[in-house]
Amino acid sequence: VPRWRQQWSGPGTTKRFPETVLARCVKYTEIHPEMRHVDCQSVWDAFKGAFISKHPCNITEEDYQPLMKLGTQTVPCNKILLWSRIKDLAHQFTQVQRDMFTLEDTLLGYLADDLTWCGEFNTSKINYQSCPDWRKDCSNNPVSVFWKTVSRRFAEAACDVVHVMLNGSRSKIFDKNSTFGSVEVHNLQPEKVQTLEAWVIHGGREDSRDLCQDPTIKELESIISKRNIQFSCKNIYRPDKFLQCVKNPEDSSCTSEI
């Protein structure tokens, strides 16, 4: 008799999830010498242990502590790039500017990037059919709690000038409900972080407005200032060209007015 299974509103666990996590771990530790000591089988066991046999609406940060411990990694605290709703460009930037790091450039962020996972209470099965949606089902689901945990730790580690890339094409350039707005902003440490610099990424080719004057950016400035951290903002009018000029300063387009 087939056992009744909870139907959640979100997509199920990414297919071949265990194999993907393990393969990513092996690849990452091969590429990053400072993480060569990591035992990827232990990492997978700790990852699995955080959500397997647990109700997928009752996951806590404590569930992920064994994984956090195994994935402990030191990145230069003054080279951190946060992002909100503009992940692809942030990742393109750190691929060019190799001394800067997004969360997904760390082992734990790299393992989980773009993946979904959840289990079922009291069974060792992974649920490939559906997983809880943050809005429609519950916020304490395995994926949301993971990202909240690693995002908090990443923000806590930051120092000096912290950069954040924001999407200037969205109605809320700064969104208090995003991971950046709800977790990272509040976990920057004022005794370590001098300045948060926002980069507002323009979408339209002819858009020369100063989006740093947007009301949501002013809201971000207010939140940051109240935490005794300085705030600065710059417009990235032509992100494609900006990236090209960071990558290759001798490109002729970098000194043309076009």
Partner: nanobody
């Protein structure tokens, strides 16, 4: 923070030369890409030349290529613009700028700007 102070402008005859200097205060001068821009009366500010943090790579706008040379001395926290074969159309206020990642035309707000130095080329 980096403060930039441009100097070396003046009045020169067509065909003559000038050397502009931009002195930066702050310990992290070598962490910044640098550039020179200019603004003629009634015109938009335009890029002239850029140089990378190490000084290993330079780039020039088409109208000045072969006549202007940008260089930097990180020990002296200074970037230079050697201008030769000057033309009346080079008349403008010249500004230096600094950015941690790239100095380029119209791509993004740059981190720091110096105040301008006037260059006037008479025919």
């Amino acid at each position: 923070d980096v403060q930039l102070q441009a100097s070396g402008g003046g009045l020169v005859q067509a065909g003559g030369s000038l050397r502009l200097s931009c002195a930066g205060s702050g310990r992290s001068f070598s962490s910044y890409a640098m550039g020179w821009f200019r603004q003629a009366p009634g015109k938009a500010r335009e890029i002239v030349a850029t140089i990378t943090r190490s000084g290993g790579s330079t780039n020039y706008a088409v109208p000045v290529k072969g006549r202007f040379t940008i260089s930097r001395d990180n020990a002296k926290n200074t970037v230079y613009l050697q201008m030769s074969s000057l033309k009346p159309e080079d008349t403008a206020v010249y500004y230096c700028a600094a950015d941690r990642f790239a100095v380029a035309s119209g791509t993004h707000d740059l981190d720091y700007w110096g105040q301008g130095t006037q260059v006037t080329v008479s025919s």
